[in-house]
């Protein structure tokens, strides 16, 4: 393999083009100054390089930029990011969404690779905060971004932001991450009137406490059985009977088809059945007319 | 995952013409370019010739006029078109497919010009 590091007769590269395509990996490394490449970084996406040249590519690059590559070069490096691993990335400094958006455009319609969330975690970091524009970009590209970050990473994002949410943004979020976003999303929304204000913060219920969904109740809001069984049990359970039937309007009668499943089963366990009865939708296991309630929890704090 | 099987191989006489096949299957959604390289007994794997997603060709200067790379993606397959062809062809044909995030290669097909 010697004799192979010299570079050709009439074989240096002057310029990135598509003559080189042909060249073999060793050539590609003897033949391309690293420079050049640094300042002709744009041109290389443009040339169906493969991916085993794309590596000396990668190679010559990490040579001339052994601390992390500049935005300058990373904001080009369209497939060649591809090739990044996440110790690569982190060496990065990028602070423009229109990096952001280049490298997240040529991992489009793949799923978040190890790279990916890397990089979005160091330009995150770098921002100081989850802005709208980012929130924005993130989740255009990868719908279900938000309910990847842990409550505490949730916490950092400004109210503000969460007008960028669309309601499938958050269909893989559990109540521990949806108990941070509600109270934000009640601030971002708080001036809307009532049946706007509704169309916003729905998706966002699972983290509603029972008095929010009390102040609901009175509002007309006919809330679909979908959204009401995602609320949180705890929050649930302290309602009445005609809360719960205002709060869902017409779609009252889809609790019979859920009065097995939580949190229903568990509301109906709490209500008196003369209470159930009113609806008349035929739910069973609602306390016994004639019973006495405990409510052991209230006794326990007072004791 | 991308697989690929080449076909269209044999033997030939100096002059003559073959056509190359490659099937290829899997996730093809992600393959981003197409091509063909060639490895002489002996000698190195060589690039031969590479076609884009939107169709644009090019070729080793030792094939330029006599090879043509086409693809046929209501078939998923692509092919190699060889005439003239002279002794020094003689070499496995490899199909090759730049996909996200690596490349896939076929395992190859023989072509012998000789008289």
């Known amino acids: 393999e010697v004799e192979k590091t010299a570079c050709p007769s009439g074989k240096k590269a002057r310029e990135i083009d598509e003559s080189l395509i042909f060249y073999k990996k060793w050539e590609l490394e003897a033949c391309v100054d690293a420079a050049l490449l640094a300042t002709q970084m744009d041109r290389v996406n443009a040339i169906p390089f493969t991916y085993e040249q794309l590596d000396v590519l990668k190679h010559k690059l990490d040579e001339l930029y052994p601390q992390g590559y500049p935005e300058s070069v990373i904001q080009h490096l369209g497939y060649l990011f591809l090739k990044m691993s996440p110790e690569d990335i982190r060496k990065w400094n990028v602070t423009s969404l229109e990096t952001l958006k280049a490298l997240l455009e040529v991992n489009k319609g793949h799923e978040m690779s190890p790279q990916v969330a890397t990089l979005i975690d160091r330009f995150v970091k770098g921002r100081g905060q989850l802005d709208k524009d980012t929130l924005d970009t993130l989740t255009a590209f990868y719908p279900g971004y938000l309910c990847s970050l842990s409550p505490e990473e949730l916490s950092s994002v400004p109210p503000s932001s969460i007008w960028a949410v669309r309601p499938q943004d958050l269909d893989t979020c559990d109540p521990r991450q949806l108990d941070v976003l509600y109270p934000k999303a009640r601030l971002a929304f708080q001036n809307m009137n009532g049946s706007e204000y509704f169309v916003k913060i729905q998706s966002f219920l699972g983290g509603a406490p029972t008095e929010d969904l009390k102040a609901l109740s009175q509002q007309n809001v006919s809330m679909d059985l979908a959204t009401f069984m995602k609320l949180r049990t705890d929050a649930v359970l302290p309602l009445t009977v005609a809360e719960v039937q205002k709060l869902l309007g017409p779609h009252v009668e889809g609790l019979k088809a859920e009065e097995r499943h939580r949190p229903v089963r568990d509301w109906i366990l709490r209500q008196r059945q003369d209470d159930l009865d009113t609806l008349g939708l035929g739910l069973q296991g609602g306390i016994p007319n004639g019973y006495l309630v405990l409510d052991l929890s209230m006794q326990e704090a007072l004791s | 995952e991308v697989q690929l099987v080449e076909s269209g191989g044999g033997l030939i006489q100096p002059g003559g013409s073959l056509r190359l096949s490659c099937a290829a299957s899997?996730?093809?959604?992600?393959?981003?370019?197409m091509g063909w390289h060639r490895q002489a007994p002996g000698k190195e794997r060589e690039w031969v010739a590479t076609i884009t997603t939107v169709g644009t060709t090019y070729y080793a200067n030792f094939v330029k006029g006599r090879f043509t790379i086409s693809r046929d993606n209501s078939k998923n397959t692509l092919y190699l078109q060889m005439n003239s062809l002279r002794a020094e062809d003689t070499a496995v044909y490899y199909c090759?497919?730049?996909?996200?995030?690596?490349?896939?290669w076929g395992q190859g097909t023989l072509v012998t010009v000789s008289s």
């Open positions: 899997g996730n093809i959604g992600s393959i981003r370019h």
């Open positions: 090759r497919a730049t996909a996200h995030p690596t490349d896939y």
